[in-house]
């Protein structure tokens, strides 16, 4: 397996009860707007063949698809939980800023495609999707980057 | 309460084909991965494949060409079926759940157990 | 595949006692290493998994160390459940591999 470089993130990051609180308000407001049950953009198929290692490199790149596809055409919905955890996600996102794998990382990028076309095939309720699943983004970042 | 149950036939012939099934409870073989492992007696711990919740299958490389793992999510069971046996394939075979979709490779539940005697 | 090579193949010692297991991996596994405690009649029991983190139910006297090849199951004030067998497995990609695992005897 590659190795990982510089992707990890501060413990503190994931012991803020206010903002953890404030992203998983934003995910269930989202996640009851989401009419879509069947599909989920955010579990072991992500993972599939990404040894743990590897993973904050992936949700890395999930994290910022996130911020750059989803979080900001729909930054005047969900409010006012969105003003707030955007910024926070933005800081994490720029604490990976040096995460990377050295090596192949094609097996990543496949994962990570296979998302980003399920919610831009899904449309607007792709977006909502993702923003339903903030909980399990956070989660999974805390898991593979701490 | 996350159970799981193997059963199958405790005496296999050798060159026959070996299938326990797992049975399971508590939770949906759609949410969670179950893996089979296997020990020989009084040694060490063998990963032999996995379930994904999606029904998509991983296997042990030392097992692939005659390993295949199957289910029936409408009665909560995971098969294993393995061809060609020898007596070296004589253990104690254990089919285990996965922690969740993250820790999908750690095994967090596991059923006792059924014990396997390749034997003429 | 990555080999694990854990020590002492056999451990004994008394209840109120500390006792270490070690585990080795071939190759670097960041902190993904998981213990399991093995009982006759009983289903094998997940203790710690990433190196560190105790498993629910784990109780406190347990605790895992160590990152990339080393790693270190410690049991402090040994009750008389303990003993049993305790296997250490790499979970950081597959096959997954297991240690050769260590007895842990009443002395």
């Known amino acids: 397996a590659p190795v990982s470089s510089h992707c990890r993130l501060d413990k503190s990051n994931f012991q803020q009860p206010y903002i953890t609180n404030r992203t998983f308000m934003l995910a269930k407001e989202a996640s009851s707007a989401d009419n879509n049950t069947d599909v989920r953009l955010i579990g072991e198929k992500l993972f599939r063949g990404v040894s743990m290692s590897e993973r904050c490199y992936l949700m890395k790149q999930v994290l910022n698809f996130t911020l750059e596809e989803v979080l900001l055409p729909q930054s005047d919905r969900f409010q006012p939980y969105m003003q707030e955890v955007v910024p926070f996600l933005a800081r994490l996102s720029n604490s990976l800023s040096t995460c990377h794998i050295e090596g192949d990382d094609l097996h990543i990028q496949k994962n990570v495609q296979k998302l980003k076309d399920t919610v831009k095939k899904l449309g607007e309720s792709g977006e909502i999707k993702a923003i339903g699943e903030l909980d399990l983004l956070f989660m999974s970042l805390r898991n593979a980057c701490i | 309460e996350v159970q799981l149950q193997e059963s199958g036939p405790g005496l296999v012939q050798p060159s026959q084909t070996l299938s326990p099934t797992c049975t399971v409870s508590?939770?949906?073989?759609?949410?969670?991965?179950v893996h089979w492992v296997r020990q020989h007696s009084g040694k060490s711990l063998e990963w032999m494949g996995r379930?994904?919740?999606?029904?998509?299958?991983s296997y042990n490389s030392a097992f692939t060409s005659r390993l295949s793992i199957t289910r029936d999510t409408s009665k909560s069971q995971v098969f294993l079926k393995m061809n060609s046996l020898q007596t070296e394939d004589t253990g104690t075979y254990y089919c285990?759940?996965?922690?969740?979709?993250?820790?999908?490779?750690?095994?967090?539940?596991w059923g006792p157990g059924t014990t396997v005697t390749v034997s003429s | 595949d990555i080999v694990m090579t854990q020590t002492p193949s056999n451990l004994a010692a008394s209840p109120g006692e500390s006792v270490s297991i070690n585990c080795k991996a071939s190759?670097?596994?960041?902190?993904?290493l998981a213990w399991y405690q093995q009982k006759p009649g009983k289903a094998n029991k997940l203790l710690i998994y990433?190196?560190?983190t105790l498993q629910s139910g784990t109780p406190s006297r347990f605790s895992g160390s160590g990152s990339s090849t080393d790693f270190t199951l410690t049991i402090r004030n040994l009750e008389p459940e303990d003993f049993g067998l305790y296997y250490c497995?790499?979970?950081?990609?597959?096959?997954?591999?297991f240690g050769s695992g260590t007895k842990l005897e009443i002395k």
């Open positions: 190759k670097t596994i960041s902190k993904y």
């Open positions: 990433s190196g560190s």
């Open positions: 379930m994904w919740s999606d029904g998509d299958t």
């Open positions: 285990a759940r996965s922690l969740d979709f993250y820790y999908d490779t750690t095994l967090a539940f």
């Open positions: 508590g939770f949906s073989l759609t949410s969670y991965s």
């Open positions: 497995q790499q979970h950081n990609e597959y096959p997954l591999t």
